[in-house]
Interface confidence: low
């Protein structure tokens, strides 16, 4: 019968011929009376056999990631009679892995959005690298992830590539961060190969800023001839938030005379001071009122940022009109 062990050849061998093993018949007594032949895909081009001894050699550099096994056939013939000594037999040559592929991030570029002020531990995104080496061959394809840029705001779980928040971030200070992640194979041991990827993390706005008046005092004038409903001026607050979180409502906090009102222009986010009752210079030539401003939408959990609404004082001078 046929005698052989399992055949392995390491990939990427630079030698011109690499001895893989021997294929022989147990009837072969070593007197060179038998001829061994190799058949199948790769026979003669990738692999050759010593026809006298049955020794098999690889004569080409092999790439396991391209092809991991070869199925060949062997024959042994008695030179004297030309007849087969053994039935033709199929055998396998396996290409064994070396760590010749670096981890690659295939889904680049990565981008994620996370609300500002998210608590530590909040999951941002998972990045995944793949390694073309053999996962069953030692640690060649076992990856460890680490953070090259992004501390102290982000952390990465070494074995999963899950990026989490490790420190609260304020969108109003910085609204996007670039995080650089490295994946290393061989679980970081000597000879490891690495790949990097970048993740753009954008902070979405939450309503963590209340509107604040630009001025602590506004001076307006109104003619005593002005009819009710007249707009006598505008006041303005600013809010560091954006979009819906910066929408605001103005209102009167104090107006003993109940002469004025404030309406909100939701296009410009300005407060418009309106005359509610006619004024008379001879009766009262100036007024002092207090206005306040609040955000339109404040979720319950963010109310802590909105205690004590911003207020401003408005001095209104009445202009005299000559009366007939």
């Amino acid at each position: 019968g046929w005698v052989w062990n399992q055949f392995f050849v390491p990939e990427e061998m630079n030698t011109t011929s690499h001895h893989i093993g021997q294929l022989r018949s147990d009837l072969d007594n070593g007197n060179n009376s038998f001829q061994y032949k190799l058949l199948g895909a790769g026979a003669g081009s990738t692999f050759i056999i010593d026809e006298r001894t049955g020794d098999i050699y690889a004569i080409q550099k092999l790439d396991r990631e391209e092809r991991s096994l070869y199925i060949l056939r062997a024959q042994v013939i008695d030179i004297a009679t030309g007849r087969a000594v053994e039935p033709e037999s199929e055998f396998v040559i396996k290409v064994s892995d070396i760590n010749d592929n670096e981890p690659k991030f295939l889904d680049e570029p990565y981008e994620a959005i996370v609300p500002e002020m998210s608590p530590e531990g909040t999951l941002v995104i998972q990045v995944t690298a793949s390694d073309a080496d053999d996962p069953s061959s030692g640690n060649n394809a076992r990856l460890l992830y680490s953070l090259l840029q992004g501390q102290p705001y982000f952390s990465v779980e070494p074995t999963t590539g899950v990026i989490r928040i490790s420190s609260k971030m304020d969108r109003e200070l910085q609204d996007e961060y670039w995080v650089i992640i490295q994946a290393k194979d061989m679980i970081g041991q000597p000879g490891a190969l690495s790949g990097t990827t970048s993740v753009l993390i954008k902070l979405s706005d939450v309503n963590d800023n209340k509107p604040i008046f630009k001025e602590s005092l506004y001076r307006l004038t109104v003619s005593e001839s002005a009819p009710t409903g007249t707009s006598i001026g505008t006041i303005m607050a600013y809010d560091n938030d954006i979009g819906e979180n910066a929408e605001m409502d103005y209102s009167i906090e104090e107006d003993d005379s109940q002469t004025f009102d404030i309406i909100t222009n939701h296009e410009t986010q300005e407060g418009i001071v309106i005359l509610k009752k006619k004024v008379d210079f001879e009766h009262q030539n100036h007024y002092g009122i207090r206005a306040k401003v609040k955000n339109h939408h404040v979720p319950e959990q963010l109310m802590k940022y909105h205690t004590e609404a911003s207020t401003t004082f408005i001095k209104i001078q009445v202009e005299d009109v000559d009366e007939p």
Epitope: L148, Y153, W178, T196
Partner: antibody
Framework: QVQLQESGPGLVKPSETLSLTCTVS????????WSWIRQPPGKGLEWIGY???????NYNPSLKSRVTISLDTSKNQFSLKLSSVTAADTAVYYC??????????WGQGTLVTVSS | QSVLTQPPSVSGAPGQRVTISCTGS?????????VHWYQQLPGTAPKLLIH???NRPSGVPDRFSGSKSGTSASLAITGLQAEDEADYYC???????????FGGGTRLTVL
Amino acid sequence: QVQLQESGPGLVKPSETLSLTCTVSGGSISSYSWSWIRQPPGKGLEWIGYIYYSGSTNYNPSLKSRVTISLDTSKNQFSLKLSSVTAADTAVYYCARNWAFHFDYWGQGTLVTVSS
Amino acid sequence: QSVLTQPPSVSGAPGQRVTISCTGSSSNIGTGYDVHWYQQLPGTAPKLLIHGNSNRPSGVPDRFSGSKSGTSASLAITGLQAEDEADYYCQSYDSSLSGWVFGGGTRLTVL
């Protein structure tokens, strides 16, 4: 307004080590990356390397074996050391702040000449 | 040899429109990394002109605009003025180098 100012010797002898410091004012060195970039006379810009305020560094592969960038947060400064210099290292050296993947603030630059 | 390729020079008369191209590869612009543009007036440090392909920092006139497509990007300047005469550099990030790369620069001459 963030301002950056390079300082260091303008003349370095061949085979010696070039040392430059960048002082950041008008803002904290914390929570950003900071880069060194150079420009040989009459030529284009070349990124040398950066340091993140946590201390992580990344260098241009062509200069990696000779470059060290370090940080002194207490002084709001970061520094460049380039060893074994030759005439080819003669350039204007700029420090800059990385914002995302571009450079939004630059120093005015300092010319370093390598000559014996 | 720069990783990003720019024409060495362009020119135009006052009031005209000029464009400067910047060609990269699959490891930088083609991967999806943004392109940024800098203006360097004679004897001064580079100044950020366009970031994130097409965004102008405050103070940069709207005569300057940027765009990106595939593995290349371009900077357009309309209504050319004498003070636009300068060197212009494109810049991106390269994943194979794990670092920032610049174009070789383009000198703009206003005729």
